[in-house]
Interface confidence: medium
Amino acid sequence: KSPVFGPQEVSSVEGNSVSIKCYYPPTSVNRHTRKYWCRKGASGRCITLVSSEGYVSSNYAGRANLTNFPENGTFVVNIAQLSRDDSGHYKCGLGINSRGLSFDVSLEVSQGPELPNGTEVYTVDVGRTVTIKCPFKTENAPKTKALYKKIGQTSVLVIDSRNYVNPNYKDRIRLRIPGTGQLIFTVVIDRLRLSDHGLYLCQAGDGSNRDEKNADLQVLEPEPELVYEDLRGSVTFHCALGLEVANVAKFLCRVNSRETCDVVINTLGKRDSAFEGRILLNPQDKDGSFSVVITGLRKEDEGRYLCGAHSDGQLQEGWPIQAWQLFVNEESTIPRSPTVVKGVAGGSVAVLCPYNPKESQSLKYWCLWEGAQNGRCPLLVESQGLVQEQYEGRLSLLQEPGNGTFTVILNQLTTQDAGFYWCLTNGDTRWRTTVEIKIIEGEPNLKVPGNVTAVLGETLNIPCHFPCKFSSYEKYWCKWSNTGCQTLPSQDEGPSEAFVNCDENSRLVSLTLNPVTRADEGWYWCGVKQGHFYGETAAVYVAVEEKKVAGSRYVSPAKADAAPDEKVLDSGVREIENKAIQDPRLFAEEKVVADTGDQAGGSRASVDSSSSEEQGGSSK
């Protein structure tokens, strides 16, 4: 399908002008290629009428032009002094007329209505309000005032000053007679319907002395605003319906093939399941305006959207509406990224978030979509490192891999973490994307002890076990903080051939803190990655305590919680049986070692891979 998009139907009146805007993907080639407006003939050929290269056909000379806006990916065709002969089928396009990079536009030019002299013309959108002004002479001031609608040769009474109201206008019309001295009465019609369209007659008094004034009321369906967005991107519909409906329920609906309108979302809590997790109805302002954001755009989201107000939260005739025609461009600049990421309870996920690569300095955010209250998205983390309290130690936003993608890591997963999350920046809002996290059955691949208590001044060693499938990955330990996860210095991870063969003695990466200081308290992550692409992580909290007074019964210098069976050894080293480990098949025994002896040289914090003293067993 062609990525060029424009208005399907354009209608106007003889003598008037039209402005036709066509959209195209703003690639470098497209921005500079020829743009054209041509008319389709009976033969199927399309004859150029105006182009961006300066050509204007004789028929269009002096009344048409084409302007390209390459920075927006749009071009505009203006045609003036329209005649009925301009009605027909046209194409706006790029390149060569026959190439197919075009959009079909139907132009209909109708004859203007023949109106009686002195007729006042009122042009109002459907659902809005019109005030018809009716002047009269002093002698008719005390006499009956009325408004009639002309239907063919007859006049039908709509409203008069004797309290008559035509049933078709019930509860939406009023006649106002001013105080003395003002020789004008007004008729106000609210919530205009298409059927209200037509010629009206104001009358004051009767007989030959009566005052009359003609009014032509043109009720228009709102011209849909064309919206051109990229596949996988985001769209915002800003809906401003006016103060008169500020306190009425609002909705966004999509027109279906039967020309009815299916509610997408409304302020009464209704939401189309097709938009679950990727829509927000932003709370309305006091002037009644609101906006709807849809992310993760799909081709099937294309179509005509209406926003409106009605107490039922759905489209009703005679209530104000706004319209959009959404086109989803499949030649998207937004890269594909997983829309569903799966993790296991206790495990982790690494989510890749795209952003506009031209905006590398923009702030990045991640928020959790909430379905309540028309959809809300509280921010959980942002690129300056700030993390919401309840996510401390288990959530980090990393600028890597960069160049249009950032990474969000969430670990210590629980079933509560399942849901939809949005990737955001404070830059180009069209790059908002949605990812769903699903929690599935299984065990985490990385195994670390539970929370660990370390003793000031001593050595702490924390093991992290990984399965064979991660043997080719880079392993790391990092210390989590609000500003990210600072990688700790890494030591040689053992002979490379051991990793290649997945030697069972090489499936452990250990963190050593020597000596332990107060500043070491906090969250540590063990993780795997390939280049700048992050894989699984596991988190452990290290608490730091003072050394106990000599002679007292021993308290482990490096104590891991949730170890049901432990032997207290005279050497001051506590052994944790495999019951503390989530997958006993992965390794038989784990030691959290507090080494009271001095270590010669070496870094204070180090990561090292060594034997896990496995008794066999295989990883999943």
């Epitope: 709370p283 305006s289 955010y365 509280p378 942002e382």
Partner: nanobody
Framework: EVQLVESGGGLVQAGGSLRLSCAAS????????TGWFRQAPGKEREFVAR????????DYADSVKGRFTISRDNAKNTVYLQMNSLKPEDTAVYYC?????????????????WGQGTQVTVSS
């Protein structure tokens, strides 16, 4: 949590100007959107202005449009409200509030963090 401290209030004559400041400390992610609200004696607290983190999206109450300007300095974690052409009806306690909700329009209910307020009195 985030702490918000307002300053800059005071007594000013009608037609005069004041600049209010709101300094945030702590978990400033909760000031992704920062707003100013005001409460006059015996009246409900009402929205005055709001600004998002980037400063690119601002919104004002009709009663202050063209007179008040909201801005922010992220390096200082501070949001400002410049109030010009002050009127007696602007007299109120002005509160700064923060929200972590990503939203095009943020209403009163979306603000979870509030300051203690600063008194602004405009005499005629």
């Amino acid at each position: 949590e985030v702490q918000l401290v307002e300053s800059g209030g005071g007594l000013v004559q009608a037609g005069g100007s004041l600049r209010l400041s709101c300094a945030a400390s702590g978990r400033t992610i909760n000031t992704y959107v920062t707003g100013w609200f005001r409460q006059a004696p015996g009246k409900e607290r009402e929205f005055v202005a709001r600004i998002d983190w980037s400063g690119s999206s601002t919104d004002y109450a009709d009663s202050v449009k063209g007179r008040f300007t909201i801005s922010r300095d992220n390096a200082k974690n501070t949001v400002y409200l410049q109030m010009n052409s002050l009127k007696p009806e602007d007299t109120a306690v002005y509160y700064c509030a923060g929200s972590a909700y990503y939203s095009g329009y943020v209403t009163h209910r979306d603000f979870g963090s509030w300051g203690q307020g600063t008194q602004v009195t405009v005499s005629s």
